[in-house]
Structure formats: C-alpha cells, structure tokens
Amino acid sequence: LTCLGGFASPGPVPPSTALRELIEELVNITQNQKAPLCNGSMVWSINLTAGMYCAALESLINVSGCSAIEKTQRMLSGFCPHKVSAGQFSSLHVRDTKIEVAQFVKDLLLHLKKLFREGQFN
C-alpha cells in the first residue's frame, strides 16, 4: 500500500502541461467574457524578458475582488519562483503604461501560445 500510494499522489506537473493549462484558462476567460473583465480595471503592462511570469502575476495580483482571474493568479504563481504580494513593482513592468485587464489577458494569451508553439515551456 505504501508503494501504491506513490502512484496515487500527483507528481510534479511537466512544464508543457502547466503552460497548456494556463493557456486553456486564459482562453476560457477571453471566450466567456461578457461584462468588462474585472470591471475594466487597469494593470501595469509588462516587458517580456526573463521573469515575465512574475511580472504578469505582480500586475494581476493588484486586481482584487475579481473571481474571473483568481485561477490565473494561482497558476502564474506556480511559474514564479518567488512570493509575490500586492503593491510590488517590478523592473519588468512598463512604467506609466497601464492597460485594461481584458487586453492584458488577451495579449498574455497570444504570447504564451507563441511560446508553446516554439517549445519554450519554462
């Protein structure tokens, strides 16, 4: 039983699977969007260099009370090696450039699809 228990417990998720699941979640958000996402909240735009996942999380974590993106926030935290809390400002943000959450999610989705096609899973 002890041995079999190892099979039942989930192992680490392959990066390709994690990225695909994040893409699927963003697709769900963009397709199911009826009213303005998160009441039209604005977030910092981001640079797409290394650390992009943390920067995306740092932007989105500042949106509170928006259940539609809570799963995305949790999934992004799995890609970010450090703890992210609201109010942080990363050098990966584009200062003075805010965009709507809906556009941010849409653009992040486009970028992640490109990464997936190119096999860049981390």
Partner: nanobody, 118 residues
Framework: EVQLLESGGGLIQPGGSLRLSCAAS????????MGWARQAPGKGLEWVSS????????YYADSVKGRFTISRDNSKNTLYLQMNSLRAEDTAVYYC???????????RGQGTLVTVSS
C-alpha cells in the same frame, strides 16, 4: 483602448527620404508581430513590410525591397518605417497595423499620408 498613432508623413521630392513612426498604446506591444500597409489613391490596400515581435525577422514587398527598412523599439512601444529613394508610386496613406494570424488580434491606425512629388 488599443491605439496606433502614425506620424512622419508629408510631401517629399522623388529620391528623398522619410521616417514614419507608429506609437502604440493600450496593449502589450512587444507581444505582437507588426507591420506597415499602404493604400494609394484609387487602389486597394497593399502590405508593405512586417517585423516579428522580437524585431529579428522582417518581410518586405518586392516593390519596396532595398529601399524601405522596418524596425521597432519595444521599450518605447514604437514601430518605424525608414523610406529611402522614394518614388511617385510610393504616394499613399501608410497604416501601422498588427500582423498576427490569430483572429481577434487585428488592429490598425488611422494612417499618415505620404506624397512623393516634384
């Protein structure tokens, strides 16, 4: 709101040079492949040049190859088109646009007029 604002057009003599700029806002510019299209008076829209998101892959229509150079500065959210050795047939309204195959990602500016005439 997504905005693409072209500038740099004007009246120029044949053989002259112009540099068009396109200031992008309201979206994550660095994610998008971008390009320039043009529409000459009484003609259809012609794709002139495109550049990938990272700025390292470019495409040019045969009609402008060797004369036009596309570039981008992702830190400034700006797309450029350097136009040299201009000809009368380059007269057109030039539009900055996204160049993505993915549906729903197509945006275009209002255009800037380039007139090549002596």
């Amino acid at each position: 709101e997504v905005q693409l604002l072209e500038s740099g057009g004007g009246l120029i003599q044949p053989g002259g040079s112009l540099r068009l700029s396109c200031a992008a806002s309201g979206f994550i510019f660095a994610v998008y492949d971008m390009g320039w299209a043009r529409q000459a008076p009484g003609k259809g829209l012609e794709w002139v040049s495109s550049i990938n998101d990272g700025g390292n892959v470019t495409y040019y229509a045969d009609s402008v190859k060797g004369r036009f150079t596309i570039s981008r500065d992702n830190s400034k959210n700006t797309l450029y088109l350097q136009m040299n050795s201009l000809r009368a047939e380059d007269t057109a309204v030039y539009y900055c646009a996204t160049a993505e195959d993915e549906p729903g990602y197509d945006y275009r500016g209002q255009g800037t007029l380039v007139t090549v005439s002596s």
